[in-house]
């Protein structure tokens, strides 16, 4: 039995649970998902039994090997998978455990602006980047373009301080998860701040 294998898949995609064995006479191979039987294979008997009929079209064995390919992945396929290789030549079954994380392809992140102030010709605010559907394991970074050197900022909140008269800047939020990334619409500092330009000491949401 090897260490737990961590696998990552995307909704609608496929993942292969790698499995090899040099056992000559394999009596059966049993795959389970969160303790529920998924597939039972009898290589010598030539039979493959998929416990739930709806999974039949999703199960495959690349190149006729022992590895299990699961396609048309859904979010709720995330969980613990376990395989046991049973053979009369083994004193106890050979086992392997896998943890599968299924992630959605990220949609365009949404940007909201916090309280804005404009003091002494400097526009100060925060931009917050978030996913509308609360997707998991999302990492946010900000790209600030337009100054002499382009800058990056980690985290969902970007503090902005932009002085009127400086060259315009563009802010873009990048949202990433283990299977995809997406970009917010670009935000121009001048446009962002012009709402507060008329009143040098104003604050707005």
């Amino acid at each position: 039995s090897g260490p737990v294998k961590e696998l990552v898949g995307s909704v609608g995609g496929a993942v292969t649970f790698p499995l090899k064995s040099k056992v000559k006479q394999v009596d059966s191979i049993v795959w389970t998902f969160n303790t529920t039987p998924l597939v039972t294979i009898q290589p010598e008997g030539g039979t493959i039994i998929v416990t739930q009929n709806r999974n039949r079209e999703r199960v495959d064995f690349p190149d006729g090997g022992y590895s299990l390919k699961l396609s048309k992945l859904k979010k709720n396929d995330s969980g613990i998978y376990y395989v046991g290789i049973y053979s009369s030549s083994l004193q106890q079954p050979s086992t392997q455990e896998y943890v599968l994380h299924v992630y959605e392809h990220l949609s365009k992140p949404k940007v909201t602006m916090g309280l804005q102030s404009n003091k002494n010709g400097t526009c100060v605010t925060n931009l917050t980047c978030c996913m509308e559907h609360g997707e998991e394991d999302v990492i946010y970074t900000w790209k600030a373009l337009g100054q002499a050197a382009n800058e990056s900022h980690n985290g969902s909140i970007l503090p902005i301080s932009w002085r009127w008269g400086e060259s315009d800047m563009t802010f873009i939020c990048v949202a990433r998860n283990p299977v995809s990334r997406n970009f917010s619409s670009p935000i121009l500092a001048r446009k962002l701040c012009e709402g507060a330009a008329d009143d040098p000491d104003s604050s707005m949401v």
Epitope: S21, K22, K24, I41, P43, E44, G45, G46, T47, I48, R56, F61, D63, G64, G65, Y66
Partner: antibody, heavy 120, light 108 residues
């Protein structure tokens, strides 16, 4: 990639023996069953038997016991089939074919075939 | 030994047609049936194993179904390159494995 390369055509006399070879590459030769299949001209397929190169274990179709002898050499990844006491009914194309792991009776890679002609 | 019977030795079809080839086992072989394609002058090629599992790289127009004693191999939309002989084979439990007599698919 998996390849099975068989020896060339044989023309043999009745009563003689012949040994044909099948050299495997691109996979773990020792841990997959190797099958042999006969096809007479214009006819169907007949399973002769199989060998597990890892330990030399063999399984034969009863019809070919005493006719075919299967062996394997792990060091050269080569399987052999010897056919003895040949008669005209042994004239055929003989294929070696690897078993899949998931269903050991299904054969996924085949050699190009070796033609054996028995004639005086 | 288990006898595999393919009732049609020849089948004629047109490009784009759907065609089904049947195979009957003389006793219950569960789902342990494979289908092979053999083109003239070539080695057989595995298409389907365990009755309905398409081998890697095989186009999805080829499908297999059945269990027990009755099995069907279907080409959903025949292509010119599908001209070949198709064999069923039982790979159930203890050998010997046995093949059907083959069905030659001819294109009209």
């Amino acid at each position: 990639q998996v390849q099975l390369q068989q020896s060339g055509p044989e023309l043999v006399k009745p009563g003689a023996s012949v040994k044909i070879s099948c050299k495997a590459s691109g996979y773990a030769f020792s841990s997959s069953w190797m099958n042999w299949v006969k096809q007479r001209p214009g006819q169907g397929l007949e399973w002769i038997g199989r060998i597990y190169p890892g330990d030399g274990d063999t399984k034969y179709n009863g019809k070919f016991k005493g006719k075919a002898t299967l062996t394997a050499d792990k060091s050269s990844s080569t399987a052999y089939m010897q056919l003895s006491s040949l008669t005209s009914v042994d004239s055929a194309v003989y294929f070696c074919a690897r078993s899949t792991m998931i269903a050991t009776g299904a054969m996924d890679y085949w050699g190009q075939g070796t033609s054996v002609t028995v004639s005086s | 030994d288990i006898v595999m019977t393919q009732s049609h030795k020849f089948m004629s079809t047109s490009v784009g047609d759907r065609v089904s080839i049947t195979c009957k086992a003389s006793q219950d072989v569960s789902t342990a049936v494979a289908w092979y394609q053999q083109k003239p002058g070539q080695s057989p090629k595995l298409l389907i194993y365990s009755a309905s599992y398409r081998y890697t790289g095989v186009p999805d127009r080829f499908t297999g179904s059945g269990s027990g004693t009755d099995f069907t191999f279907t080409i959903s939309s025949v292509q010119a390159e599908d001209l070949a002989v198709y064999y069923c084979q039982q790979h159930y439990s203890t050998p010997p494995y046995t093949f059907g007599g083959g069905t030659k698919l001819e294109i009209k």
